[in-house]
Amino acid sequence: ERLPLTPVSLKVSTNSTRQSLHLQWTVHNLPYHQELKMVFQIQISRIETSNVIWVGNYSTTVKWNQVLHWSWESELPLECATHFVRIKSLVDDAKFPEPNFWSNWSSWEEVSVQDSTGQDILFVFPKDKLVEEGTNVTICYVSRNIQNNVSCYLEGKQIHGEQLDPHVTAFNLNSVPFIRNKGTNIYCEASQGNVSEGMKGIVLFVSKVLEEPKDFSCETEDFKTLHCTWDPGTDTALGWSKQPSQSYTLFESFSGEKKLCTHKNWCNWQITQDSQETYNFTLIAENYLRKRSVNILFNLTHRVYLMNPFSVNFENVNATNAIMTWKVHSIRNNFTYLCQIELHGEGKMMQYNVSIKVNGEYFLSELEPATEYMARVRCADASHFWKWSEWSGQNFTTLEAAPSEAPDVWRIVSLEPGNHTVTLFWKPLSKLHANGKILFYNVVVENLDKPSSSELHSIPAPANSTKLILDRCSYQICVIANNSVGASPASVIVISADPENKEVEEERIAGTEGGFSLSWKPQPGDVIGYVVDWCDHTQDVLGDFQWKNVGPNTTSTVISTDAFRPGVRYDFRIYGLSTKRIACLLEKKTGYSQELAPSDNPHVLVDTLTSHSFTLSWKDYSTESQPGFIQGYHVYLKSKARQCHPRFEKAVLSDGSECCKYKIDNPEEKALIVDNLKPESFYEFFITPFTSAGEGPSATFTKVTTPDEHSSM
């Protein structure tokens, strides 16, 4: 009959930080030099032996005289309660056929972690525990005095637990969140009535979950060093040095080498000159709670990230071409580089690709003259494209060329006794056509009636007009723009000896917010185009004179500009240009982009006051300088009479008072006889002009009293 192999010499040690019990024991009566498969059943009780909280089996092969070890982690801190452990065994080996039976239990081993020392009446456990966000944690308090009421608070909010015995209460905290890197605060308060007997607290250090490094990548710029980078994600460091930032280690499996990285998001790896081409890297992130790793496998020649090109220069720069040169850092013999050139200028971008060996060169053509360009270049391995280098760039400016377009020229001709005064205007050439800085304009005046006679006026830039006094002959005027290289084509305009068409009637037009829509009858005969010019009606014509060229087959145009202001009248003239470049005035138009109500009222005089009538006149009132076309006048009259005078009708003023109103529809009718009045009567009048936008401003009424019948004025 077999002896039961009872476990003996059971010893239990504790690890408070890990909240673990470590058991060690031996087995008696084991045959000498024999190995047996055995099962051990372990029972763990809490507070009292009858309160079994865990039972489990542990299977192992046991040798003679062997000390066996087994550990168990408690969810409750060991300081919270006394634990009891016992063990029994069963032989489970083919060498011993059935029946097998369990040994007796070992005696209970009591485990008590005493941290409840001193005079304190309250303790909270565990102290300074480090856990990962989302884990479940059990805490407890131990109260010396069961008469005390103990309340516990997590971050200032009361929590409720389960009483394990009169002195101990445990709290299960489910899925603890990360709150701050200095930990989650928990405190308990012992009180009797409203007297606080003591407070104790712990910090639960909750770490963010360590993330797998993202975007792990390695590359070389010189075949000497591999530069590896990654996104480390959240830093899991905690305060009070409870957990430092996660560490990063590079491990290369082909060479078996390992390197602890000193930076959180990059690491350099020395390439040994043993022609290793393939690398298999594992990046390991590690903190006190876990490890995370990522892997990359690559061929070294496929991971070349070149240093940026250098010595970028421009040679043989002229007005339209340049040769761009650059150098690349040589990293291996017979290496082919693919380079990309970007050319920025005049708001445009061009891109070119070129393959090179050592030094780069590219012919840049079709450039604009006198233009600053920014050219930049980047390169990559042409054989195994990995990524572009950084850009290297430089600015250069092309040389000037002669202006390529004639200036846009127009004129105002005013007739004076015995001569013409011609005011000549031109628009500055656009950058595209100036091809450099315009220095001066040549104005050549040629008398067409005396062909040998011509005059040259040189006008320094940036002037854009000049005044010429010419006699009553026909003249051809040429305007040429000049820069440092040469002259533009000439702009030609002819001034006829005949006076301009004076018979043209001025037509009123209404503008819109978008500007003025103009149309005209085509000029009989051949025309090479039309010109519309305009200016502010009330100002000196030179102030804001503008013009627009219109093609020969067009008889309408829209003049739209932000310069048009409400309440300002603009005068437009439309000219036809003959094949001989003689301008003929076709139409005149005038109007407002937006009419406004009159800005002032007329100054009214009272004439010929009699006992039965008086005359009102405002002859000095100018209808021209108003913010809209004056359409007429409203005459307001107040009197004691109930009825309005003939031609007047009842009206209500803005203040609600009643009066009589008479409307004059002719803006040039600037007088009114008010008759059928009573002698020695009191009258009040007020006259205001009106436009399509409304009346003039409100004003006070003027008082008039008619004399008696026998008086004479």
């Epitope: 020392t117 001193g118 005079q119 304190d120 971050e155 200032g156 606080s196 003591g198 407070m199």
Partner: antibody
């Protein structure tokens, strides 16, 4: 930024009462207790008592029992300390301090309120 | 009630020297519950050390605390001009009262 801001200086006659306020900002008021400490001119620090901001429970130094009351208004994150039957030896600077029960120290202090008791 | 006795009452040293301040308890104090404070004239005290040896936030590493049971020490490894002040030790048990030592004045020699 964590701050404790106390009310201004007071001058009182013997037998009168004084009430000092301490307004907290920059942290969860109910996560920490408040201790009151005083310092007579040229003397050391004397603990007067503490207040549990969550429960309102208090514990007072034996020598002040019956004369001192500590209260809290969690809606305004303000603690108050009232001292009655003032004597000339109550002349001192009165400090409120945040009691941190996680590392058992007073880690944030008010600027102090001078109370002068004089006839 | 636990009585804390600090020594010396006054300590005269020069900048750059090492300062050692002592705090003795009338009965055993858990090291978790001993703190040190610095106070300058006209200012509130400032927490330097908690749990006998842990530096509070923002305290330079020239300040260190040690000790257990009844004997505790505050050491300033290399005095800076701004370190001259009064230093207090304080104990906290979960049973009141909290008590302070009488203070050590650290002055420039």
């Amino acid at each position: 930024q964590v701050h404790l801001v106390q009310s201004g200086a007071e001058v009182k006659k013997p037998g009168a009462s004084v009430k000092v306020s301490c307004k907290a900002s920059g942290y969860t008021f109910t996560s920490y207790g408040i201790s009151w400490v005083r310092q007579a001119p040229g003397q050391g620090l004397e603990w007067m008592g503490w207040l549990s901001t969550y429960s309102g429970n208090t514990n007072y130094a034996q020598k002040l029992q019956g004369r001192v009351t500590m209260t809290t208004d969690t809606s305004t994150s303000t603690a108050y300390m009232e001292l009655r039957s003032l004597r000339s030896d109550d002349t001192a600077v009165y400090y409120c301090a945040r009691g941190n029960f996680y590392y058992y120290g007073m880690d944030v202090w008010g600027q102090g309120t001078t109370v002068t008791v004089s006839s | 009630e636990i009585v804390l006795t600090q020594s010396p009452g006054t300590l005269s040293l020069s900048p750059g020297e090492r300062a050692t301040l002592s705090c003795r308890a009338s009965q055993s104090v858990s090291s978790s519950y001993l703190a040190w404070y610095q106070q300058k004239p006209g200012q509130a005290p400032r927490l330097l050390i908690f749990g006998a040896s842990s530096r509070a936030t923002g305290i330079p590493d020239r300040f260190s605390g040690s000790g257990s049971g009844t004997d505790f020490t505050l050491t300033i490894s290399r005095l800076e001009p701004e370190d001259f002040a009064v230093y207090y030790c304080q104990q906290y048990g979960s049973s009141p009262p909290i008590t302070f030592g009488q203070g050590t004045r650290l002055e420039i020699k």
